[in-house]
Each structure stands twice: as structure tokens, then as C-alpha cells.
């Protein structure tokens, strides 16, 4: 999916109002220095591509993020403010139901969410630069 035509202001507002709080809650008990940020993004569409990938694509050591509250809110935000995104999720949603996994917060998941926080902050910064 090409995130070029999204309403970035609306996405930023949703992130600042609610998604950021859920990400921070997930990370509670860990320090920001516990993990190094290894994933970056260069512009707003690129940041959203990386955020989508890290939030919804299961990895061998962290398969459960898509069911978290911040992930559900991220999905809703992209579906609402990115033209045509919801259509791309119809088959993806059905596939995700089939591979539902037990929720476990592993250190690898905490690291992945730390990367997500970094990507979202980068997304906000690129937005501010444009303004």
C-alpha cells in the first residue's frame, strides 16, 4: 500500500491523543535506554510503511503485537485516514483471524514496540518539518 495520500494531520492527532499512550503503557517498566533504535524512516509515507510492517507483520520472536490495543488503534487510524487502505485489509483480517496466537509480552516484543515509538516520533518530526 502507498501511504502518500493519507491525511497525515489526522493520523498525527490520533497518535498524540491515544496511540502514544497505549505504546507507553505497553513499555511500562522499561527504560528508553534499554533498546537501541535500529529502524528508521525518511518521510511520512515511509514512516507509515515501517510502522505498518512492525505493527502487523509477525516475526518469529514476537508474533502477538497485532492484537494489542495500540495496534488495533493504528489499524483504525490507517483505515480511516488513508484512502483505500481499508480495502487492502479485508483479506488480511481474515488471514489474521486464522493465525491468532497466545498473547505473550517477550523482551523481543518490547524491543519491537520501542522501535515503533521511535518511528512514530520520526513521523511527527517529519510532519513538523513540512509545516
Amino acid at each position: 500500500y502507498d501511504f502518500t495520500n493519507c491525511d497525515f494531520q489526522k493520523i498525527e492527532a490520533d497518535y498524540l491523543r491515544t496511540i502514544s499512550k497505549d505504546l507507553i503503557t505497553y513499555m511500562s517498566g522499561t527504560k528508553s535506554t534499554d533498546f537501541n533504535n535500529t529502524v528508521s524512516c525518511s518521510n511520512r509515507p515511509h514512516c507509515l510503511t515501517e510502522i505498518q510492517s512492525l505493527t502487523f507483520n509477525p516475526t518469529p520472536r514476537c508474533a502477538s503485537l497485532a492484537k494489542e490495543m495500540f495496534a488495533r488503534k493504528t489499524k483504525a487510524t490507517l483505515a480511516l485516514w488513508c484512502p483505500g487502505y481499508s480495502e487492502t485489509q479485508i483479506n488480511a483480517t481474515q488471514a489474521m483471524k486464522k493465525r491468532r496466537k497466545r498473547k505473550v509480552t517477550t523482551n523481543k516484543c518490547l524491543e519491537q514496540v520501542s522501535q515503533l515509538l521511535g518511528l512514530w516520533r520520526r513521523f511527527i518530526r517529519t510532519l513538523l518539518k513540512k509545516q
Partner: antibody, heavy 120, light 107 residues
């Protein structure tokens, strides 16, 4: 089963406000946005706006911006649409309709409609 | 905003005949089009979503096709309860919009 039950008919004077409610049951309220659509007598459907409980945000059709306010009470699974500065052209049936925001993404259940008549 | 143009405005057919309803978008909207049926005094009822996805409980004589700007709702064999107004709606981007409807009436 999924049900959206709207408040009863209203007769209002021009310049006044009306608040229509939509009580949802049979599903998880925060998994769906609540849209409001109106239909003037003998006319087509017109999207007014939506409230997304999961994100605590709303969006409006520019035609209604400033006059329509869409809210929700998550504790009672009830959505509200308030329309102010009413004029005779606002005489219409007002519908609420749910739309999945993390799946389905379509208005798959509708309220029965609320007739609002604006007359002096 | 995206404008949806439905044609024809009215379709006069007999039970058992095939109905073909058209919906054209003013810009590319991929497959983000949904079809609703509305009878007098009732709320709209969802028939088809995302151009061609069927809904459980809706008879399989209703089918949808199309992508980009041109969409079609087909009713393979009209039954007496199918005479109603049909609307297309886009959810590609805000503000969501509806077509002006096609009335399917008994000939």
C-alpha cells in the same frame, strides 16, 4: 443480535437544535465507528459525519461542519447527533449506522431512522 | 469530494428478468464501493461490500463487480421483493458519498 435503536420523532422550530440518540447492542461498541446519514423527503442519502469511539475522534461532512456535533457515551453504548440552527431544509429522516474500524469497514447495520420535522 | 453517478435513474422490469445497475465514480476509488437496497419507510440494507464481496443472508442472485471508476450491481432473476431503490456508496475517502439511487420498478 446487532441492534441500533434510535430515539423517537421530533418536531422543532427553525433556529432551534435537535439531539438524536442511537443505542447500540449486540456487539462491542468500540470496535465500530458510528456514522450518521440523513435522507430528506423523496431525496437520496447524505453522509453527515462519524464518531470513532476507539480513537475518541470524529469527522464531518463540510456541509454540516459547525452545525452538527457527533458524540458517544461508551458506558451506555449510545451515540448522539446534535444539529443546531435548524431550518426547514433539515426536515429529514436521520439514520445512525455502524461501521467496523478494524475489520469489515462497511455500514453493515442501521438504526430504524428518526424523523425530524422543522416547522414554524 | 467523490461524486457517484448512478444509471439508469429508473429501471422498469418484470419478475424473472435480469437487472443491471451502474455506478460511476468521478475519480479512481479502487474497489471501495458498497451497494444498499432501500424500500419505502425502511432503512438501507447492505447487499454487497467492496465491489463484489457478498454478505451472509443476502440471496446469491445479487452480485457486484467493477473496480477503479466503474461498478455494477446485478440481480440475476428479479423476485417481487427486489423492487426497491438501490444506492452505491464509496468509503475510499472522506467525505463518504452516495449515488442518487436507481429505482427498480415493476414493468
Amino acid at each position: 443480535q446487532v441492534q441500533l435503536v434510535q430515539s423517537g420523532p421530533e418536531v422543532k422550530k427553525p433556529g432551534s437544535s435537535v439531539k438524536v440518540s442511537c443505542k447500540a447492542s449486540g456487539y462491542i461498541f468500540t470496535d465500530y465507528a458510528m456514522h450518521w446519514v440523513r435522507q430528506r423527503p423523496g431525496q437520496d442519502l447524505e453522509w453527515m459525519g462519524t464518531f470513532i469511539p476507539l480513537l475518541d475522534t470524529s469527522d464531518y461532512n463540510q456541509n454540516f461542519k459547525g452545525r452538527a456535533t457527533i458524540t458517544a457515551d461508551k458506558s451506555t453504548s449510545t451515540a448522539y447527533m446534535e444539529l443546531s440552527s435548524l431550518r426547514s431544509e433539515d426536515t429529514a429522516v436521520y439514520y445512525c449506522a455502524r461501521m467496523g474500524v478494524t475489520h469489515s469497514y462497511v455500514m453493515d447495520a442501521w438504526g430504524q431512522g428518526t424523523l425530524v420535522t422543522v416547522s414554524s | 469530494e467523490i461524486v457517484l453517478t448512478q444509471s439508469p435513474g429508473t429501471l422498469s422490469l418484470s419478475p424473472g428478468e435480469r437487472a443491471t445497475l451502474s455506478c460511476r465514480a468521478s475519480q479512481h476509488i479502487s474497489r471501495s464501493v458498497h451497494w444498499y437496497q432501500q424500500k419505502p419507510g425502511e432503512a438501507p440494507r447492505l447487499l454487497i461490500y467492496f465491489a463484489s464481496q457478498s454478505i451472509s443472508g443476502i440471496p446469491d442472485r445479487f452480485s457486484g463487480s467493477g473496480s477503479g471508476t466503474d461498478f455494477t450491481l446485478t440481480i440475476s432473476r428479479l423476485e417481487s421483493e427486489d423492487f426497491a431503490v438501490y444506492y452505491c456508496q464509496q468509503s475510499y475517502s472522506f467525505p463518504y458519498t452516495f449515488g442518487r439511487g436507481t429505482k427498480v420498478e415493476i414493468k
